[in-house]
Interface confidence: low
């Protein structure tokens, strides 16, 4: 049997026998274009493709549409994998989305959506989510039905304000919505009463900016 040399996601890498967490090269569906991603091979059985990570404020997340489309940061630290890759990937097969959150008091929580995909760029990478479970709130902190993605230079929200400019970062803003994991990073003791921080309203409430976040996806049939 010929060994698989290209992988579309971290689940394929895991199933090929590479079960150590780290940076791997993925290939766009139906293409030879490559992208580097962090694969979490430890959490909940492994095979997770990390599409977003925040941990220390070392990377600026107030980026342009093009940067959010193509990805930025370092897969070893804070990064955004890229809307185009995620859209193409999740358009081919059914994926679940797991969001892991840490607060400044040592608590952790997660939200798990049993179906996640991003529409194409022509639909502003609109997010689609169903089937929420987990410990980070019984109500989805990503507004339902899903919103279009907005950045500082591409305002697609439902607010007369420009949510991305007002709250910082690119996100699926509604008007402006109860979450923004790409907001301004605030250190401990400066992380409360922050309008533009890293927000997950239905876990930590108003104005609380989180310590760390990870968004990761995996095929539903893994």
């Amino acid at each position: 049997k010929e060994e698989q040399t290209t992988f579309r996601d971290c689940a394929e890498i895991f199933k090929s026998g590479l079960t150590t967490s780290g940076i791997y090269t993925l290939t766009f569906p139906n293409s030879t274009e490559e992208i580097k991603a962090y694969c979490d091979m430890d959490v909940g059985g492994g095979g997770w493709t990390v599409i977003q990570h925040r941990e220390d404020g070392s990377v600026d997340f107030q980026r342009t549409w093009k940067e959010y489309k193509e990805g930025f940061g370092s897969p070893l630290g804070e990064y955004w994998l890229g809307n185009e890759f995620v859209s193409q990937l999740t358009g081919q097969h059914r994926y679940v989305l797991k969001i892991q959150l840490k607060d400044w008091e040592g608590n952790e929580a997660h939200s798990l959506y049993d179906h996640f995909y991003l529409a194409g760029e022509e639909s502003n990478y609109r997010i689609h989510l169903t089937g929420l479970t987990g410990t980070a709130g019984k109500i989805s902190s990503i507004s339902q039905p899903g919103s279009d993605f907005s950045t500082k230079d591409s305002d697609n929200d439902k607010c007369i304000c420009k949510c991305s400019q007002m709250l910082s970062g690119g996100w699926w803003f509604d008007a402006c919505g109860p979450s923004n994991l790409n907001g301004q990073y605030y250190p401990q003791k400066q992380n409360t009463n922050k309008f533009n921080g890293i927000k997950w309203y239905y876990w930590k409430g108003s104005g609380y900016s989180l310590k760390a976040t990870t968004m990761m996806i995996r095929p539903a049939d893994f």
Epitope: S143, K158, C159, I160, A175, C176, G177, P178, S206
Partner: nanobody, 133 residues
Framework: EVQLVESGGGLVQSGGSLRLSCAAS????????IGWFRQAPGKEREGVSC????????YYADSVKGRFTISRDNAKNTVYLQMNSLKPEDTAVYYC??????????????????????????WGQGAQVTVSS
């Protein structure tokens, strides 16, 4: 019963000023986001400005930035829209509105009901503003 009543509209010459008031009853206005919207004849209602509950953050449409100022007097349970350097294109019926959800526990803007017309379900009757050239 929640009620919003606008006042202060009228006829003014281009370059002039008006101050609109939005008096609220039936709820404590300071915990709620209040938006000002306007509708010109034959056009869709559009957002002008809003002030969020709790933290009084303010937002303005690009077309009015630097000319309009929104403010809140909690003691009077009233929100104001000070309109300076008025232009003929500012002619419209001006409405104030709030979201019944309100998020009394904190700033409505944090929850997400800031300035979208779609989010608001309590509206005043409107105040006519006419700017002549």
């Amino acid at each position: 019963e929640v009620q919003l009543v606008e006042s202060g509209g009228g006829l003014v010459q281009s370059g002039g000023s008006l101050r609109l008031s939005c008096a609220a009853s039936g709820f404590a206005l300071d915990y709620y986001t209040i938006g000002w919207f306007r509708q010109a004849p034959g056009k869709e209602r559009e957002g002008v400005s809003c002030i969020s509950g709790g933290d009084t953050s303010t937002y303005y449409a690009d077309s009015v930035k630097g000319r309009f100022t929104i403010s809140r007097d909690n003691a009077k349970n009233t929100v104001y829209l000070q309109m300076n350097s008025l232009k003929p294109e500012d002619t419209a019926v001006y409405y104030c509105a709030t979201d019944s959800a309100g998020v009394p526990a904190g700033p409505a803007a944090v929850y997400g009901s800031t300035c979208s017309r779609l989010e608001y379900d309590y509206w005043g009757q409107g105040a006519q503003v006419t700017v002549s050239s």
